[in-house]
Amino acid sequence: GGGGAAPTETQPPVTNLSVSVENLCTVIWTWNPPEGASPNCSLWYFSHFGDKQDKKLAPETRRSKEVPLNEKICLQVGSQCSTNESEKPSILVEKCISPPEGDPESAVTELQCIWHNLSYMQCSWLPGRNTSPDTNYTLYYWHRSLEKIRQCEEIYKEGQYFGCSFDLTKVKDSSFEQHSVQIMVKDYAGKIKPSFNIVPLTSRVKPDPPHIKNLSFHNGDLHVQWENPQNFISRCLFYEVEVNNSQTETHNVFSVQEAKCQNPEFERNVENTSCFMVPGVLPDTLNTVRIRVKTNKLCYEDDKLWSNWSQEMSIGKKRNST
């Protein structure tokens, strides 16, 4: 229950509903209690966004939402005397915030970012349709671990795309990845409409390639041992091992279900290493191995980004053709 008796009449509307933006994309609405509310009313506030999404009933006179300000967003707020969701709230008061001014055709498009090896973020975008070729872009970013909004220093161009990279290193704090990075791209001259993006740190993570440490043959199996990219714990990764055989010209890719170094043939207790046995490999032929990794869906929501392939390592002899 939510406290005092709930009078049947509807409460007056909230007052002084206002909206502001913190950081780059944190929109904050605040309001005051209604004037002339029933004295025996324990006030609760019902709020939802314009599309009736994210309904909330809470005693606080504030609500925030992390949202890319590429379009208008509105919050409606009403008051009521209990936590009973079926109680009709007061008349709803609405306050909206619009994106910054500018020609929508001038805003950059396809603004996206990849978090490389949990150590730096690389963002890229395409110019808007109504922009001059000499537009000087600038990218701003903010994350909860930063005290203030930062500007990305080195803007580069690669084909049609512009881009910029900035350091963002995962810290041991367990909540680090629960927060997103807020991004804004605009131009120095202020001629284009700014574009915003919010990048959850549980998505778009691309590990560095692993490093093969050792290949050896044992009882008709090829034993592969590799070092995982730094910054990742083994529970958050999985692997593909590719083996090319020069004689049979076969090209096999193994989805590694287990990558534990439990066999005596493997170097044991080496930090951050993984192992796999490839069955039925001919030792008297040349076998070339490479490995790639990607993040596990239990740790990171987006699992589409494989690392690049590792450097190749070979074992065995290339047979002379007779």
Epitope: R235, F238, Q257, E258, A259, K260, Q262, L298
Partner: antibody
Framework: EVQLVQSGAEVKKPGESLKISCKGS????????IGWVRQMPGKGLEWMGV????????RYSPSFQGQVTISADKSISTAYLQWSSLKASDTAMYYC???????????WGQGTLVTVSS | EIVLTQSPGTLSLSPGERATLSCRAS???????LAWYQQKPGQAPRLLIY???SRATGIPDRFSGSGSGTDFTLTISRLEPEDFAVYYC?????FGQGTKVEIK
Amino acid sequence: EVQLVQSGAEVKKPGESLKISCKGSGYSFTSYWIGWVRQMPGKGLEWMGVIYPGDSYTRYSPSFQGQVTISADKSISTAYLQWSSLKASDTAMYYCARFPNWGSFDYWGQGTLVTVSS
Amino acid sequence: EIVLTQSPGTLSLSPGERATLSCRASQSISSSYLAWYQQKPGQAPRLLIYGASSRATGIPDRFSGSGSGTDFTLTISRLEPEDFAVYYCQQYETFGQGTKVEIK
């Protein structure tokens, strides 16, 4: 040989608490996720959640978040599933299973039947 | 949330016949995650296929998996008497509702 051995069947009353167990052997218990799967009478399989005993990191299905608690004691290679207040609708067979990073349950326990009835 | 829909609900076949079971995802998924299980009455499920097409340890080669994107298939090339059971597909946190393969 990889084995997961679960605790025995339980009969409980609504509102009671319960903790069932799953003991792993024959592999490095701290290097694999362990998951729990529910199967209500005559129904299909439901993914409840997983734990990584190495660091006790847990992940729950939204349907089971807040309804159950998954824990592990790596010193005795045992994972647990617990309820603080059982409901009749918790009556089901509960399976624990090993869950490699690749995302499939490769070895299963024999199941623990939980019956909740007044 | 991804939904996996299996079809048909029941498949009535004779031993020696070929069984084709379908699993359709509500949105495209990585084939890396698609697994198939067999469950017989009173028993725990058993992993047959992981990564959409890789056979689990000890699974006979009459079982094969294929597919990508949203459509995945489990094929049993020649049904043996012990293959009559319920089959589930799974993708991380989601199981399909199951297909029962019964003797005709």
